[in-house]
């Protein structure tokens, strides 16, 4: 036997109070899918949440942050302060990056210089609060009559043709 | 896409009335109508709205004056007994969207209704 | 409903002049609110939404701005085209003393 509820739309409810009809969900409520037993409250974006996308008889309110804050989590859960680049969040507030550190972004952690001699590289570039350090040719490369190597050509993807 | 009122008329106090706005070009299932009066020489009110979804929702002070009804292609506006206080010109308007926190951008050119013995 | 009061109920100013519009909302409606003009035998035109959202065609002389219960219209470089009534309307669906879409009382603009 087919339950009579499936046949009510999004943006209605299945209303037990009434015999099972499909009601019109009230205003500040919505139902995304058919044959719901109930409305879904709006989301509300108050505070340092703003609304990105208003609530309907169909789909929930969709938030982002006020100027000064990012979204973190799914559905943008909560809004953290923006940084300046060369700084990180802590519980104090925004802090430098300390020394042999970067953040390049307005949020993020700070996150220490490449060490380009893992790699067998020199520093071309002194890494800085807001960059990371440019990694050069290793020191051998540099010496008097080290070969100049000129390197492959990249790869293109299959499918792309040269612009 | 439009809207068009009719139906406003010279009625006696007391006998029904019922307004129809007509929309074409635009489907009622996407968009909220609101109904909207004007005395002579007086401001906007807000008699009540139908929602997207068929929701209708009328102001306070309407307290049964008024019905709101919706079919795939009219909304009606009956004034269920009428009085002189009734008489004005009928503003029907679509939303601009199908948010309930919509507002109104395509308004219809009134129908007028005078309540008179 | 919410209540809607709009001030002044009439104001003059010279072409080339600025008019300030004041909307004040009996409870707090975040940004939801819309300006209309009217013209007498016309319905009423959409110039602004969501506070301070210049609608679709509206000259940039038109500038909206508030939010909460205080709301403002301003009409800079007054032109003749301008003489009309100006409404205020809330939009702001779910308050706590239940939907609506009220007006404000309207400010008749005389262009001299």
């Known amino acids: 036997l087919q339950d009579p509820c499936s046949n009510c739309p999004a943006g209605t409810f299945c209303d037990n109070n009434r015999n099972q009809i499909c009601s019109p969900c009230p205003p500040n409520s919505f139902s995304s899918a058919g044959g719901q037993r109930t409305c879904d409250i709006c989301r509300q974006c108050k505070g340092v949440f703003r609304t990105r996308k208003e609530c309907s008889s169909t789909s929930n309110a969709e938030c982002d942050c006020t100027p000064g804050f990012h979204c973190l989590g799914a559905g943008c859960s909560m809004c953290e302060q923006d940084c300046k680049q060369g700084q990180e969040l802590t519980k104090e507030g925004c802090k430098d990056c300390s020394f042999g550190t970067f953040n390049d972004e307005e949020h993020g952690v700070c996150r220490p210089w490449t060490d380009c001699s893992l790699d067998g590289k020199s520093v071309l570039v002194n890494g800085t609060k807001e960059r990371d350090v440019v990694c050069g040719p290793s020191p051998a490369d540099l010496s008097p009559g080290a070969s100049s190597v000129t390197p492959p050509a990249p790869a293109r993807e299959p499918g792309h043709s040269p612009q | 896409q439009s809207v068009e009122e009719s139906g406003g008329r010279l009625v006696t106090p007391g006998t029904p009335l019922t307004l129809t706005c007509t929309v074409s070009?635009?489907?009622?299932?996407?968009?909220?109508m609101i109904w909207v009066r004007q005395a002579p020489g007086k401001g906007l009110e807000w008699i009540g709205v139908?929602?997207?979804?068929?929701y209708i929702s009328h102001a306070t002070w309407v307290k049964g004056r008024f019905t709101i009804s919706k079919t795939s292609t009219t909304v009606g506006l009956e004034i269920t007994s009428p009085t002189t206080e009734d008489t004005a010109t009928y503003f029907c308007?679509?939303?601009?969207?199908?948010?309930?926190?919509?507002?109104?951008?395509?308004w219809g050119q009134g129908t007028l209704v005078t309540v008179s013995s | 409903d919410i209540v809607m009061t709009q001030t002044p109920a009439s104001v003059e100013a010279a072409v080339g002049g600025t008019v300030t519009i004041k909307c004040q909302a009996s409870?707090?409606?975040?940004?939801?609110l819309a300006w209309y003009q009217q013209k007498p035998g016309q319905p009423p035109k959409l110039l602004i939404y969501?506070?301070?959202t210049l609608a679709s065609g509206v000259s940039s002389r038109f500038k909206g701005s508030g939010s909460g219960t205080e709301f403002t219209l301003t009409i800079s470089d007054l032109e003749s085209a301008d003489a009309a009534t100006y409404y205020c309307?809330?939009?702001?669906?779910?308050?706590?003393?239940?939907?609506?879409?009220?007006f404000g009382g309207g400010t008749e603009v005389v262009v001299k």
């Open positions: 969501k506070a301070s």
């Open positions: 139908v929602y997207d979804n068929g």
């Open positions: 409870e707090s409606i975040s940004n939801y």
């Open positions: 070009g635009f489907s009622l299932s996407t968009y909220a």
């Open positions: 309307q809330t939009n702001y669906c779910c308050s706590s003393s239940d939907n609506g879409f009220a």
């Open positions: 308007a679509r939303s601009a969207d199908g948010s309930w926190s919509t507002y109104f951008n395509l």
